[in-house]
């Protein structure tokens, strides 16, 4: 399955939108920094078959979509930007879902992939728990926004590696 070029552009657009969503100066939030333990190894395309990598990407985008679709998220961000951001993520999910169906038919996805998806889910659980502990404060959301920008950048790099493998 070849992800369309529009998928990469969508990922870039999502990153730009997320970058524009900030409402407060991040300089006031330095002491709120937190180690979410991003599962970097899951974004290393070299160790995965293509089907696995696409499944990990799908989970990453799905969890990001879920995080920014909550009521608390709606209260935190400017509505039109949030809607555009969610639309970009939704389009990416559609692209990836088509690929997941196609690729899983070609390759049997081993248990290792379940571990990778679980690692991504646990990562987002840590992010959600942080937001709860910080009572969804503006700084907590600002830290999470920075973290998601970082993880989306990793996703973009994984997609680039996948295209080079084709």
């Amino acid at each position: 399955c070849d992800l369309p070029q529009t998928h990469s552009l969508g990922n870039r657009r999502a990153l730009i939108l997320l970058g524009q969503m900030g409402r407060i100066s991040p300089f006031s939030c330095l002491k709120d920094r937190h180690d979410f333990r991003i599962p970097q190894e899951e974004f290393d395309g070299n160790q995965f078959q293509k089907a696995q990598a696409i499944s990990v990407l799908h989970e990453m985008i799905q969890q990001t979509f879920n995080l920014f679709s909550t009521e608390d998220s709606s209260a935190a961000w400017e509505q039109s930007l949030l809607e555009k951001f969610s639309t970009e993520l939704y389009q990416q999910l559609n692209d990836l879902e088509a690929c997941v169906i196609q690729e899983v038919g070609v390759e049997e996805t081993p248990l290792m992939n379940e571990d990778s998806i679980l690692a991504v889910r646990k990562y987002f659980q840590r992010i959600t728990l942080y937001l709860i502990e910080r009572k969804y404060s503006p700084c907590a959301w600002e830290v999470v926004r920075a973290e998601i920008m970082r993880s989306l950048s990793f996703s973009t790099n994984l997609q680039k590696r996948l295209r080079r493998k084709d």
């Epitope: 100066s25 991040p26 920075a146 973290e147 920008m149």
Partner: antibody, heavy 121, light 107 residues
Framework: EVQLVQSGAEVKKPGESLKISCKGS????????IGWVRQMPGKGLEWMGI????????AYSPSFQGQVTISADKSISTAYLQWSSLKASDTAMYYC??????????????WGQGTLVTVSS | DIQMTQSPSSLSASVGDRVTITCRAS??????LNWYQQKPGKAPKLLIY???SLQSGVPSRFSGSGSGTDFTLTISSLQPEDFATYYC?????????FGQGTKVEIK
Amino acid sequence: EVQLVQSGAEVKKPGESLKISCKGSGYSFTSYWIGWVRQMPGKGLEWMGIIDPSDSDTAYSPSFQGQVTISADKSISTAYLQWSSLKASDTAMYYCARHPGLNWAPDFDYWGQGTLVTVSS
Amino acid sequence: DIQMTQSPSSLSASVGDRVTITCRASQSIDGALNWYQQKPGKAPKLLIYFASSLQSGVPSRFSGSGSGTDFTLTISSLQPEDFATYYCQQSFDFPLTFGQGTKVEIK
């Protein structure tokens, strides 16, 4: 390879203006903040201020607020430090360094080579 | 502002010695402390971040510990290339502040 390359040494007279630069390469320039640090001859390190190149938001140390201006041009991946009226006490080595912002990652992990500014009549 | 106080301001040691430098913050900074090494005429180099994480490429003889207000940089076995000035820096809040430095000289 991540690199921060600073402009060359400057010799200026008191009252003159100056703008020194720091060009980033090998990484996404807008994903990191750029900080500026002063080191006067034979002295320690002093943090001056920082900029987020993605939107040019800045923060300054109270000691340097109003004395210098930090700016950035993300289109050419370059941050700047400028003075409108130099004093002899501005004579120092100035370093730029990248900062991960709100991400949990090493602070000031890459530094420029430094720009020596000499102010003398 | 958060004041950072290093001790000692200088020390003399021999190759192979275990060297300890301390840094105290004027208020709690959790674990938001970095250590840098600077050699004459060179830019500082990050050694340790978030109090105890070893920066990539830094030899394992360097280690950091502490949290709250008291922090330590330890060089387990001093090497000839370790003679330099060491700075701590808090990254807990703005304005960021450095310690005054500790110069490690050859005995």
